[in-house]
Interface confidence: medium
């Protein structure tokens, strides 16, 4: 006699927060402490993420959802789900293998993260430098010589940040 398998897997009845315990005739058992299952029908619970070191707990682990981490002050998240923390630098600096280093002359960084970027070359747009750049700020381009006729006074705002997803502060 061959027992026909039920069309419906008994484990599919186990809700999130439980697992289908093969050692107990596939009874739905609660996830043990420090573990979770975010979907039904799981045969095991996943170990909760621990936020330690530079990672801080943003959301505690529950039986149905993993813990979420962010970074301690002075660091910022990188990667999906804040899988890494990267050190902040000051404005006017960038992070290198040797720690935070000042932007080289002719470059700037107006954020605590990211790289130093070249000042805008005003002359490429036929404009002149109205305000010089610094390590922290891009140059401000002013009107071209031709625009300096009486009645003309337009100033181009600083170029937007060129790193996708990062807006200037």
């Amino acid at each position: 006699f061959e027992r026909t398998r039920s069309l419906q897997d008994p484990c599919s009845n186990c809700p999130a927060g439980t697992f289908c315990d093969n050692n107990r005739n596939q009874i739905c058992s609660p996830c043990p402490p420090n573990s979770f299952s975010s979907a039904g029908g799981q045969r095991t619970c996943d170990i909760c993420r621990q936020c330690k070191g530079v990672f801080r707990t943003r959301k505690e682990c529950s039986s149905t959802s993993n813990a979420e981490c962010d970074c301690t002050p002075g660091f910022h998240c990188l990667g999906a789900g804040c899988s890494m923390c990267e050190q902040d630098c000051k404005q006017g600096q960038e992070l290198t293998k040797k720690g935070c280093k000042d932007c080289c002359f002719g470059t700037f960084n107006d954020q605590k993260r990211g790289i130093c970027r070249p000042w805008t070359n005003c002359s490429l747009d036929g404009k002149s430098v109205l305000v010089n750049g610094t390590k922290e700020r891009d140059v401000v381009c002013g009107p071209s010589p031709a625009d300096l006729s009486p009645g003309a006074s337009s100033v181009t705002p600083p170029a937007p940040a060129r790193e996708p997803g990062h807006s200037p502060q």
Partner: nanobody, 123 residues
Framework: EVQLVESGGGLVQPGGSLRLSCAAS????????MTWFRQAPGGGLEWVAN????????YYVDSVEGRFTVSRDNAKNSLYLQMNSLRAEDTAVYYC????????????????WGQGTTVTVSS
């Protein structure tokens, strides 16, 4: 399980020495930059030193240059921080972390941290 465990901290007098160790497990240690950080009482985390995969590149924060030496033994899956001429301002919890300030092409992030070991420099 990916894990880092620091040891070797303790109480030492100014001018003394300590050697911190960081034992790695659960990953291929020799593939990663490794970094030491510290956190003084009431302060933020400060990068101390880092070392590349084979130990040929080492970098230090200015305040410990010439006094601290970072090293590693890939055969033992271990990272070390030899601290000489210790000062009161070196008092902190010291953490090792996987990754480093420049271990990847696109980021400088650390993803695995130890629990820390406490170093107290006091007379």
């Amino acid at each position: 399980e990916v894990q880092l465990v620091e040891s070797g901290g303790g109480l030492v007098q100014p001018g003394g020495s300590l050697r911190l160790s960081c034992a790695a497990s659960g990953f291929t240690f020799s593939n990663y930059w490794m970094t030491w950080f510290r956190q003084a009482p009431g302060g933020g985390l400060e990068w101390v030193a880092n070392i590349n995969q084979d130990g040929s590149e080492k970098y230090y924060v200015d305040s410990v240059e010439g006094r601290f030496t970072v090293s590693r033994d890939n055969a033992k899956n271990s990272l070390y921080l030899q601290m000489n001429s210790l000062r009161a301002e070196d008092t902190a919890v010291y953490y090792c972390a996987r990754g480093g300030l420049g271990y990847g092409d696109s980021h400088y992030g650390m993803d695995v941290w130890g629990q820390g070991t406490t170093v107290t420099v006091s007379s």
